[in-house]
């Protein structure tokens, strides 16, 4: 058993049929010695008396808020949560496996630049009685500070019969140098509590590996005289690290017909313009990627050919 | 990338082209190592990230873009002395910091070159003959060093009398390639920045 926060404790349980429960001794936080009684949750029934209460925690029915009282006055509370371990593996019932980039990916994180700011998100089908708390650091043995905000519900989607909820959090490394070469990964730890179930999820990454630039901005077309060709121009996104001559991007320019089946023409360039043939009803899209470290491509920025 | 890239003209800055070749070569070598050594811990998640140049050179600090010198987190200054006569400077007037920067890059390349050559000698003794260092990568390191044209003492190649542990050597190769790729990215950024200055 360990303390998650003040008056909230996590009991770790081996979750197999013939596992013995965990013996837990609750102590009433009071100088009083006698006349103390214990209750659970909303029930007024006395579960035991005395300054300590020894319980066996085996089921979610044994978890909850234990309260000690004296003469009708509440003395202290202890909320017990359960963390299940099945076949040596901690349960992951609360969050959905996003399966990207690999199986057992519960947390996904992205950074728009090298400033040390990043966003992580996760999915769940649970809509109520759900809380998250996020901590992060650079490295784990001698951790350096990363500050994370509160996790918020960022999207709701309908997937078949189920509703899916996306939560996200923003974090910022306390003293980040955009040019630094990372040798210790960022660690992100999410505590998830659903009713009386506790779970924790972790992700470890280098900022360089989660870079995904914003799409190029100010995408414009300039027709070339007496030609079907157009000059496409764009700019670096505002959120990209500066100076751009140091943090350079490379670009992919794509001409896409109205039908998805039509052949796509693609050109790669390090410049912020390109000359392409603009077909009728086609659209031109441009996306960006770090020029020197191949992390994710940005989403496309698009304009119609007409 | 699977399609032709419109590469910019290296312009006046002769080292830019070499640094681009270097990054391409080390990235290819790392990819080859990860495929060949698929049953070894050779991915970024699995290896320990060691920097053989730590406390010996300070490339990131010495080559920091001017715009980032206001960022206190980037000013992790280290007292390191460097030789300051390089030919990549072309005909430009360059600051002492730029000379320090290129000198630091040269020292990095020299250290990695020694490590890779020592390692290759060990890998050539492996009866499995599983993996060797790409000669192209070693040649590209050499070319960039020559383009930088710094005079510095030659570091003797390390020789080991004991029987090499091939498993450890291959893991060390992965560690070295990961670290060198990160440094090659920094070098490429620096060359691009200097080329634009």
């Amino acid at each position: 058993i360990w303390e998650l926060k003040k008056d909230v404790y996590v009991v770790e349980l081996d979750w197999y049929p013939d596992a013995p429960g965990e013996m837990v001794v609750l102590t009433c936080d009071t100088p009083e010695e006698d006349g103390i009684t214990w209750t659970l949750d909303q029930s007024s029934e006395v579960l035991g008396s005395g300054k300590t209460l020894t319980i066996q925690v085996k089921e979610f029915g044994d978890a909850g808020q234990y309260t000690c009282h004296k003469g009708g006055e509440v003395l202290s509370h202890s909320l017990l949560l359960l963390h299940k371990k099945e076949d040596g593996i901690w349960s992951t019932d609360i969050l959905k496996d996003q399966k990207e980039p690999k199986n057992k990916t519960f947390l996904r994180c992205e950074a728009k630049n090298y400033s040390g700011r990043f966003t992580c998100w996760w999915l769940t089908t649970i809509s109520t009685d759900l809380t998250f708390s996020v901590k992060s650091s650079r490295g784990s043995s001698d951790p350096q500070g990363v500050t994370c905000g509160a996790a918020t519900l960022s999207a709701e989607r309908v997937r078949g019969d189920n509703k899916e909820y996306e939560y996200s959090v923003e974090c910022q490394e306390d003293s980040a140098c955009p040019a630094a070469e990372e040798s210790l990964p960022i660690e992100v730890m999410v505590d998830a509590v659903h009713k009386l179930k506790y779970e924790n999820y972790t992700s470890s990454f280098f900022i360089r590996d989660i870079i995904k630039p914003d799409p190029p901005k100010n995408l414009q077309l300039k027709p070339l005289k007496n030609s079907r060709q157009v000059e496409v121009s764009w700019e670096y996104p505002d959120t990209w690290s500066t100076p751009h001559s140091y943090f350079s991007l490379t670009f992919c320019v794509q001409v896409q017909g109205k039908s998805k089946r039509e052949k796509k023409d693609r050109v790669f360039t390090d410049k912020t313009s390109a000359t392409v043939i603009c077909r009728k009803n086609a659209s031109i899209s441009v996306r960006a990627q770090d020029r020197y470290y191949s992390s994710s491509w940005s989403e496309w920025a698009s304009v119609p050919c007409s | 990338r699977n399609l032709p890239v419109a590469t910019p003209d290296p312009g006046m800055f002769p080292c830019l082209h070499h640094s681009q070749n270097l990054l391409r070569a080390v990235s290819n070598m790392l990819q080859k190592a990860r495929q060949t050594l698929e049953f070894y811990p050779c991915t970024s998640e699995e290896i320990d990230h060691e920097d053989i140049t730590k406390d010996k050179t300070s490339t990131v600090e010495a080559c920091l873009p001017l715009e980032l010198t206001k960022n206190e987190s980037c000013l992790n200054s280290r007292e390191t002395s460097f030789i300051t006569n390089g030919s990549c400077l072309a005909s430009r007037k360059t600051s002492f910091m730029m000379a320090l920067c290129l000198s630091s890059i040269y020292e990095d390349l020299k250290m990695y070159q020694v490590e890779f050559k020592t390692m290759n000698a060990k890998l050539l003794m492996d009866p499995k003959r599983q993996i060797f260092l790409d000669q192209n990568m070693l040649a590209v390191i050499d070319e960039l060093m020559q383009a930088l044209n710094f005079n510095s003492e030659t570091v003797p190649q390390k020789s080991s009398l004991e029987e090499p542990d091939f498993y450890k050597t291959k893991i060390k190769l992965c560690i070295l390639l990961h670290a060198f790729r990160i440094r090659a990215v920094t070098i490429d950024r620096v060359m691009s920045y200097l080329n634009a200055s």
């Epitope: 049929p17 949750d41 909303q42 579960l47 209460l53 066996q56 089921e59 979610f60 029915g61 009713k195 | -």
Partner: antibody, heavy 119, light 107 residues
């Protein structure tokens, strides 16, 4: 006052189905799991299983798994035990009981439902 | 599963006497053992939990002791209403199991 009131005695033929009930009152129904115990004529007590009234989480005695089904209706604070096809060997007194949280024993019991299966 | 063996199977005693019933487990159940009393035609009633804790409303003449594999239920001075069948039950490991019962009869 805590009370567990069980449905009346049943006489059934082999192969028939049956659902007996246990209605709780006088306490917070969702705080306490409900269990079932069998007592064959002239025999001792046998633990069938327990069930959470919150989310219908169930722990069956392997000996009874597949033979009986436990269920619960939170809105009426009622627990059920049912058989899809009775056998003569199911003849017994069935007790529902309230599981004490933080312990696991049964602190309050229903009066029992006698089930007789005979052709 | 854990087997609980009660002894004796039948105990004859007179009111006012001390009665002791034993319960032995086939493996340790820590202190997670309860005692119940059942009278003819009635449902069982909880007497003792956690091996030695008296259920509220139960007279103090009933007491329990033991831990691990050996447990005892003691009635210090028998009253006429105490003559019944007594069961021990372990609730350490699923499936929870009961002893076969001890009949306490009037001598």
């Amino acid at each position: 006052e805590v009370q567990l009131v069980q449905s009346g005695a049943e006489v059934k033929k082999p192969g028939e189905s049956l659902k007996i009930s246990c209605q709780s009152s006088g306490y917070s129904f969702t705080t306490y799991w409900i269990g079932w115990v069998r007592q064959m004529p002239g025999q001792g007590l046998e633990w069938i299983g327990i069930m959470s009234p919150v989310d219908s989480d169930i722990r069956y005695n392997p000996m009874f798994r597949g033979q009986v089904t436990m269920s619960v209706d939170k809105s009426s604070s009622t627990a059920y035990l049912q058989w899809s096809s009775l056998k003569a060997s199911d003849t017994a007194m069935y007790y529902c009981a309230r599981r004490r949280p933080g312990q696991g024993y049964f602190d309050f019991w229903g009066q029992g439902t006698m089930v007789t299966v005979s052709s | 599963e854990i087997v609980l063996t009660q002894s004796p199977a039948t105990l004859s005693a007179s009111p006012g006497e001390r009665a002791t019933i034993s319960c032995r487990a086939s493996q340790s159940v820590s202190s997670w053992l309860a005692w119940y009393q059942q009278k003819p035609g009635q449902a069982p009633r909880s007497l003792i939990y956690s091996a030695s804790n008296l259920q509220s409303g139960i007279p103090a003449r009933f007491s329990g002791s033991g831990s691990g594999t050996d447990f005892t239920l003691t009635i210090s001075s028998l009253e006429p209403e105490d003559f019944a069948v007594y069961y021990c039950q372990q609730y350490n490991i699923y499936p929870y199991t009961f002893g076969q019962g001890t009949r306490l009869e009037i001598k």
